[in-house]
């Protein structure tokens, strides 16, 4: 009977920079799966004592776990399993509707480091790689999961990636993004936006790193034929990534309809709620889908566009299609038209 | 409703100590793993140390290790942040926080749901 306590029980944690928290995925027969927060005839907001999970932290290589839950969004991959029978337990799960599950969310604590505190690679007077590549994002102080400078670490070397403007690397780009665990690209960050300006309260392994890369094939399949090493450049940008997986994703609700499932559209970012304005690019039916998902709604019966009369009325923007693109919003301070959406009610 | 009452701030010379307790009512105290950040004028909250909900984990910024120690006692609803060796640079506004969201990183200040108002520590010769 297979459950998250077994010596071959495979887990990880996704759709973030850090293999010590994010949304659970597990090996079962058949490949990877997200487990749903719905299993186990939780409800899909109950929050769990998360010492629970204490077991899969430990596999993972983490400390103990902090908060096990919903995670606030759910990104899913082709596979979600609802699972049934005792917390934890897997030998009993069925396929769930991809547009039903919610995903479960664990954050375990970094591990009790026992050397002195350091994330990076020693200095480059070691021997020459002998590990595998990895790739690291670096968000900024407080920044986003999936989004900053990429770092590309060679056995003992490590440094960011130079880049140029003109480089034609769409298809690297989704390549580092993919073996990040971090979805598709979205867009290049500008320096500002991915942190690179040195803080200089900012713990010593976030210093810049002693060596540079450059993008040597950008075709490439496997990370050790992408970079090559070069001299560290005093100027020139370095390569930092907005992914499709970033977090945190901005939140939506319905406010003051007749039931949960209808209402004008408000979205938060950071702490505070404001109104949805219309734009141009959402015309399609797709954002509204997309919210009405997240209320855990049917799917969308109608939308309309309130008339904007007020020169004062005023509320968040996002340029793109659906509100999951959106990795900042921008503030309207007039004639911002508000919108009404009606979802079917799952519980009528 | 999770509500944290933050105490103990106040003004120290450098080198010496201060303990911050912050008091949680309206939640399963023992479930939730507890944290403190703090905001000095003009910068950004910063994350100062969590501990887990049974209390045998804990994690601190780089910052303060070896300086402050996190610590709760779960039968008063109770969480404290013993610091020593106090330095100018620990002045802030320490805030008491709750209510973690599952997967997100401990670190991030928009990854706690609940807050407390805030307690001033001064560090000042």
């Known amino acids: 009977r297979l459950s998250w306590y077994d010596p071959d029980f495979q887990a990880r944690l996704t759709r973030s920079n850090s293999k010590c928290q994010g949304q659970l995925e597990v090996y079962l027969k058949d490949g990877w799966h997200m487990v749903c927060s719905q299993s186990w005839g939780r409800s899909s907001k109950q929050w769990e004592d998360p010492s629970q999970a204490s077991k899969v932290c430990q596999r993972l290589n983490c400390g103990v776990p902090l908060s096990l839950g919903p995670f606030l969004v759910t990104y899913t991959p082709q596979s979600s399993i609802i699972c049934y029978g005792q917390l934890g337990s897997f030998s009993n799960c069925s396929h769930s509707r991809n547009d039903m599950c919610h995903s479960l969310g664990l954050t375990c604590l970094e591990p009790q480091k026992t050397t002195p505190p350091t994330t990076r690679p020693p200095p480059t007077t070691t021997p020459e790689p002998t590990a595998p590549p990895r790739l690291q994002l670096v968000a900024q102080s407080g920044g986003q999961h999936c989004a900053g400078v990429v770092e590309f670490y060679s056995g003992s070397l490590g440094g960011t990636i130079s880049y140029e403007a003109q480089d034609k690397t769409q298809d690297l780009e989704n390549f580092l993004c993919n073996n990040l665990q971090c979805g598709s690209f979205l867009k290049h960050l500008p320096e500002t936006e991915a942190g690179r300006a040195q803080d200089p309260g900012e713990p010593r392994e976030h210093q810049p790193l002693p060596i540079q890369w450059k993008i040597q094939n950008s075709s490439c399949t496997s990370l050790e034929h992408c970079f090559r090493k070069i001299k560290p450049q005093k100027s020139g940008r370095v390569l930092a990534l907005l992914c499709s997986g970033f977090q945190p994703k901005v939140q939506s609700r319905l406010v003051g309809g007749s039931s949960i499932c209808e209402g004008t559209v408000e979205v938060r970012q950071g702490a505070q709620w404001a109104a949805l304005c219309d734009s141009s690019s959402a015309r399609s039916s797709l954002r509204w889908e997309e919210v009405c998902r997240e209320q855990q709604c049917g799917s969308v019966n109608s939308y309309r566009v309130l008339d904007a009369g007020d020169p004062t009325s005023r509320g968040l923007f996002c340029p793109h299609q659906k509100l999951s693109q959106c990795h900042e919003l921008w503030e309207r301070n007039s004639y911002c038209k508000k919108v009404f959406v009606t979802c079917q009610d799952p519980n009528p | 409703q999770v509500q944290l009452v933050e105490s103990g701030g106040g003004l120290v010379q450098p080198g010496g100590s201060l303990r911050l307790s912050c008091v949680a009512s309206?939640?399963?105290?023992?479930?939730?793993?507890m944290g403190w950040f703090r905001q000095a004028p003009g910068k950004e909250r910063e994350f100062v140390a969590v501990?887990?909900?049974?209390?045998?984990?804990?994690q601190y910024a780089d910052s303060v290790k070896d300086r402050f120690t996190i610590s709760r006692e779960n039968a008063k609803n109770t969480v404290y942040l013993q610091m020593n060796t106090l330095k100018l640079e620990d002045t802030a506004v320490y805030y008491c926080?709750?209510?973690?969201?599952?997967?997100?990183?401990?670190?991030?200040?928009?990854?706690?749901?609940?807050w407390g108002q805030g307690t001033q520590v001064t560090v000042s010769s």
């Open positions: 309206g939640g399963t105290f023992s479930t939730y793993g």
């Open positions: 926080v709750s209510g973690h969201r599952p997967g997100w990183a401990v670190i991030r200040a928009d990854a706690y749901e609940y």
């Open positions: 501990i887990t909900g049974s209390g045998v984990g804990t």
